[in-house]
Amino acid sequence: DYKDDDDKLDFPGDGRAVWSQNPNLSPVNESQLFLYDTFPKNFFWGVGTGAFQVEGSWKKDGKGLSVWDHFIATHLNVSSRDGSSDSYIFLEKDLSALDFLGVSFYQFSISWPRLFPDGTVAVANAKGLQYYNRLLDSLLLRNIEPVVTLYHWDLPWALQEKYGGWKNETLIDLFNDYATYCFQTFGDRVKYWITIHNPYLVAWHGYGTGLHAPGEKGNVAAVYTVGHNLLKAHSKVWHNYNRNFRPHQKGWLSITLGSHWIEPNRAESIVDILKCQQSMVSVLGWFANPIHGDGDYPEVMTKKLLSVLPAFSEAEKNEVRGTADFFAFSFGPNNFKPLNTMAKMGQNVSLNLRQVLNWIKLEYGNPRILIAENGWFTDSYVQTEDTTAIYMMKNFLNQVLQAIRLDGVRVFGYTAWSLLDGFEWQDAYNTRRGLFYVDFNSEQRERRPKSSAHYYKQVIGENGFTLREATPDLQGQFPCDFSWGVTESVLKPESVASSPQFSDPHLYVWNATGNRMLHRVEGVRLKTRPAQCTDFITIKKQLEMLARMKVTHFRFALDWASVLPTGNLSEVNRQALRYYRCVVTEGLKLNISPMVTLYYPTHAHLGLPAPLLHSGGWLDPSTAKAFRDYAGLCFRELGDLVKLWITINEPNRLSDVYNRTSNDTYQAAHNLLIAHAIVWHLYDRQYRPSQRGALSLSLHSDWAEPANPYVASHWQAAERFLQFEIAWFAEPLFKTGDYPVAMREYIASKTRRGLSSSVLPRFSDAERRLVKGAADFYALNHFTTRFVMHEQQNGSRYDSDRDVQFLQDITRLSSPTRLAVIPWGVRKLLRWVRRNYGDMDIYITASGIDDQALQNDQLRQYYLEKYVQEALKAYLIDKIKIKGYYAFKLTEEKSKPRFGFFTSDFKAKSSIQFYNKLITSNGFPSENGGPRCNQTQGNPECTVCLLLL
C-alpha cells in the first residue's frame, strides 16, 4: 500500500468512498474550479493509434486476414476495407504529425497477422517486420519513446477459424509465443509494453453483444470464458517478460483496462452508491481486481455470475495477481456506447475522469497510472475545425491535472487518442477521433492538424495550463463619486396606500349599544394628516432592503402601462406617479439616489399599455410619439429628483419578441432608437436646463470570444456578434447616426446570395441627425461572455442573419442557467466600448448571476468580487471612465432564475454583506490604502436632493 500526501493509508477496495467525498462542495471552491497549474516535471505526453484502425493495406505484402477484416466483410456495411489513413504506406507522414505535436511517446499496436499471417510463430512476414523496425528506429531517432501494444483486437482470422478465438485456452500459449517474438525482436528498443488493449470490450462486444469482431452474441458463458483466457494470456506474458526479458531490457509491462464512470441518482443514497460501485467493479473490476487487486474476480461478480464465471484456483490467483507494472487506463467513447449495453444499474453515466482516477486510487491502493487512451469523437463530416474536441480535451486534461495536484493520484502519462482519423470499430468511418484529419478518399492521405492538434501541442509545450486570462488583481479604489447601485426590474405601483389611518376626519365610538359596531360622534371633526409615503407597504419593504444593501443608487423601472393605461395622456394614473415619487423621496432620505428606467420590456406583454400593444407595438412608428408623451410626463413629475434616466432597457433584446421575421426585428429596433432619440432631445431642450440630469438607454452587452482561437471564422463570428448585438444600437447613437457598416454589408451580402431577405431600415438625414449623439453616457447590462462560432444559416430571422452559433465551455464555472463566469469579459467589453465610441462616461447598469442558494450564495459573491475587480482594472489601467456598477438584482421573482440578493419572500442572502464591504471600501483598498471618500462626497447628487426635501 502507498501513502498519500496526507499520510493516510489508502486501503484497496475502498473505491465507493469516492461518491461520498465532499458532496456539498461550493462550486467556487478552489478544488472545483479549472486548475491553472503544470503537470509534474517529465510528465509523459503521448498519442496513440491502433494498428487495424490506421495501417490499412489489409492484404498487402503478405499480411494475414484478421477477425476484423472478416467482420467488416460479413457484418459491417463498409464501402472500402482500405479506406483508412494507410499508415503502413505513409509512415513518414505519421512521423511528421508526431513531430508537430512534440509528444514524448507514441503508443501504437503491432498487427499480429501482419507479422504472423496465420497467427503461429514461424517465420515472420519480412515486410511487416521491416515496417515495425522502421517505425521503432524512426521514433527513437526523434527521441519519441515507443509504447507498444501487442494486441489491439486484430486477432489473426486463422486462429478464430481454427480454435474459436479467445474462447479457446490454446490462444494463451499462442499469444505468449507471439509476445516472446516481439520481446526478442523489438524489446531492445521498447521500454513500455501493453499486452492487450481493453479486454472488457473484446469479451463484451466481441462475444456478448456481437458489435465487435468476431461478432458472436448471446452466449453469456462465452463472454466470461473469453475474459478469463485474456487474463491468463496477459498473466503468462507478464511472467514471461518478467523472468526472461526484464533483467536486460529493463522495461515495464501492463494491460490497458477501459471503463466508463457513473454517478448515483441521489448522492446521499447508500443504495445508489452501492449500485455505482457494482457498475464499476463489473466492468473495470472484472479485469482490474485479479491483476491490481487480490487476484480474484470481484465478490459482486462471483456471487452474481456463479454459473457462468470461471473460477481461479489459488495458484492461478497468485499467478495473475500483481501482473502489471503500472495501471494502464482507457477512458473514451468505446466504453460508453452503445448506452443500452452498459452496466448502468439505473444510475447516471458521467465523463468525470477525475473521479474515476480517484476510484482507481482508492480501489487499488494508489497505483502509478498511465492514461493509455483518452479522448472523444466528432462526426465524420468534421474536418480540421473540431472545436468541441478542444473543449473535451481541455476538460479531460484538467481533470487529470486536478487528480494529480489536488487528489494525489499518481498519473505519470497521458495518451491522447488518436493521432489520426481511422476506422472506428462498429462506427466504421462514421466518426473521427484523430488529432489529424485524413481524407480517406484522397490519394496521398495528407495528415492535416485539427484544432485539437494545435491545442494539444500547446498544452504539451507548456506542460499544462498557464493562466493566460488575467492581469493580477489590483488593490485600488473607484473614484469618490462612483455609483454603487442595485437594479430592480419594473416596480408595480400599489394602487392604494395601505394605511387609511387619519384620513377620515370623524370621531367614532365602538360598541356603544353593544352591537360591536362603530358609531360616529356627531359635531366633532378631527384634524387629518395627509397621506404619507410610508403608507405604501411595498415601499417600506423596499427601503428596508435598500438600507441593508448600503448602496448609493437604486435603479428601478416605471410601469408605463400603470402610469398611462390608455397609452396617452387622456388618463393619467396619479396614484402610480405618487407611488413612484415616494420611492424616490424615501430613497433620497437614505442618501440613495435613483436611476429611473422609463421602459423595461417584459416578455409577457412587452410592458406596453394595452392599446399601444394592440396597434402594433414597436412596429407602429406612432408608439415613439406615445413614448415621448409618457417620458415628458415622467420628467415633469419626477425629474426634479431624478438625475439619471434610462429611456429603454435592453432594446437590443426585443428581437426575442419581434421575431416573426428579421424585418420585424429591424423595424422594431429602428422605431425604438428613434423613440429614444426623440425623448433625449425632449429632455435636452425642455428639462435638462432646470433638472440637470443625464439620460441614455441600457444595452444588453455580453462579451463574445471565439470558441476556437485557431480558426479565423470564429473570431470573425465573435466580431459579428458584437456588431449585431451591441453596435446595432451603439453605432447610431454614439458614432455615426447609422447602423454599423459591417452589419449592413453582411445582411446585404446574404440577401444577394439568396440566403436571407432581410433589409436593414435606412435613416433619413433628419433621423440621422436626431439619433447621432442622443445619449449622455453609455449604459450597459453585462452578465457573461459567450463563446461564438461561425455557422452559416438560411432564413430571414435576426438570429440567422448573424451566422453565429454559441458553444458552452464545459470547463468554465457556470450558473444554473449556464451563464459562464468570465470576469475578464467585462474588461474587454469596456475597452471595446472606449475604442469604438470614445472616452465617455460608462455605467454598468446591471450585472449579476443566478445562484441556486437561498442563503449562502457563494457563486454570487465570487461573481461580484471578480467582475468588480475587472471593472477596477478597466478604470485604473485602461483609463475607462466607469461611473457606476449596479448589481442585478434586488429581489428574485418566484419560479424564475435566482438573481436576487433577497429571495422572493424578502429573505436576505449572504452576498449582501459581501457587496456592503465592496461599497464601504469603494473597491479593493490596500491595507494602508489612500484616503477614503467621505460619504457625502461619494454621493454628489444627494446634497441637492436633501435640500429639496
Epitope: 493566460r468 465573435a718 466580431e719 454614439f734 457598416v741 470614445g838 472616452d839
Partner: antibody, heavy 120, light 111 residues
Framework: QVQLKQSGPGLVQPSQSLSVACTVS????????VHWVRQSPGKGLEWLGV???????DYNAAFISRLTISKDNSKSQVFFKMNSLQTTDTAIYYC??????????????WGQGTSVTVSS | DIVLTQSPTSLAVSLGQRATISCRAS??????????MTWYQQKPGQPPKLLIY???NLQSGIPARFSGSGSRTDFTLTIDPVEADDVATYYC?????????FGGGTKVEIK
C-alpha cells in the same frame, strides 16, 4: 485601394514641434483606428500612439507629455503633433491603419512615411 | 515595456531552403486566449508590410510559404522555401500591452 498619404515638413528646428497630417482613402475613420510609428537607425521601430475609431487615444508613456493625435472624420484626416523635438527624434514617421478587428491588434496598411530631420 | 529580442540579427539562406526567425518576449504576450504577436516584412525604402497576425494567421495576399507559430514568450516566423523576393528585414511586434513594441529586426539575405 486603401491608402494613407502623409504630409509634413522634412526639417524641424530643435525644441520646435512637428505636425504631420495623414489623409486616408478607401476606408472610414469611424471604422478604423490610425497608429503612428517612427523608425530611426538608432532605435528601430517605435510605436508612438493611436487614435481609435471612436476618437479615444492611447499614447506611448514615453511620449505622452508632448504628443497629441486628433482627427477629422468628415475630412478623412488624422493629425499628429509632437512638441519639443530633439535631434534624437530624427526618424521616418509613419501613419498606419489598425487592422480593425476587436480580436486582432495589428497594423495592416502603412503610409509612405515622412522623413523628419531635427537639426538647427 | 515588453522587450522583444529577435534572433539571429541576420540570416543568409540558400534559395529553396527554410529560414527560421525567432522572437522572444521579456514577458508573455498572450492573454484571454489570444496571442498578440505580429510579423512584418520591410524592404529598403518601403514601409513595413503585414505578414502574420495573432502569431499564426496569414494576412490575405501573403504566400503560404510564410508561417508563424509559438505561444506566450517564444514565437517563430518560418519561410519555406525561401525565394529571391523574400530578401528583406523581418520584424516581430507585440500588442498585448501598451506600448506596442517591435523587435530589432532580422535581415534575410540569399546565400
Amino acid at each position: 485601394q486603401v491608402q494613407l498619404k502623409q504630409s509634413g515638413p522634412g526639417l524641424v528646428q530643435p525644441s520646435q514641434s512637428l505636425s504631420v497630417a495623414c489623409t486616408v482613402s478607401d476606408f472610414s475613420l469611424t471604422t478604423y483606428g490610425v497608429h503612428w510609428v517612427r523608425q530611426s537607425p538608432g532605435k528601430g521601430l517605435e510605436w508612438l500612439g493611436v487614435i481609435w475609431s471612436g476618437g479615444s487615444t492611447d499614447y506611448n508613456a514615453a511620449f505622452i507629455s508632448r504628443l497629441t493625435i486628433s482627427k477629422d472624420n468628415s475630412k478623412s484626416q488624422v493629425f499628429f503633433k509632437m512638441n519639443s523635438l530633439q535631434t534624437t527624434d530624427t526618424a521616418i514617421y509613419y501613419c498606419a491603419r489598425d487592422y480593425g478587428s476587436t480580436y486582432v491588434d495589428a497594423i495592416d496598411y502603412w503610409g509612405q512615411g515622412t522623413s523628419v530631420t531635427v537639426s538647427s | 515595456d515588453i522587450v522583444l529580442t529577435q534572433s539571429p540579427t541576420s540570416l543568409a539562406v540558400s534559395l529553396g531552403q527554410r529560414a527560421t526567425i525567432s522572437c522572444r518576449a521579456s514577458e508573455s504576450v498572450e492573454s484571454y486566449g489570444n496571442r498578440y504577436m505580429t510579423w512584418y516584412q520591410q524592404k529598403p525604402g518601403q514601409p513595413p508590410k503585414l505578414l502574420i497576425y495573432r502569431a499564426a494567421n496569414l494576412q490575405s495576399g501573403i504566400p503560404a510559404r510564410f508561417s508563424g507559430s509559438g505561444s506566450r514568450t517564444d514565437f517563430t516566423l518560418t519561410i519555406d522555401p525561401v525565394e529571391a523576393d523574400d530578401v528583406a528585414t523581418y520584424y516581430c511586434q507585440q500588442s498585448n500591452e501598451d506600448p506596442w513594441t517591435f523587435g530589432g529586426g532580422t535581415k534575410v539575405e540569399i546565400k
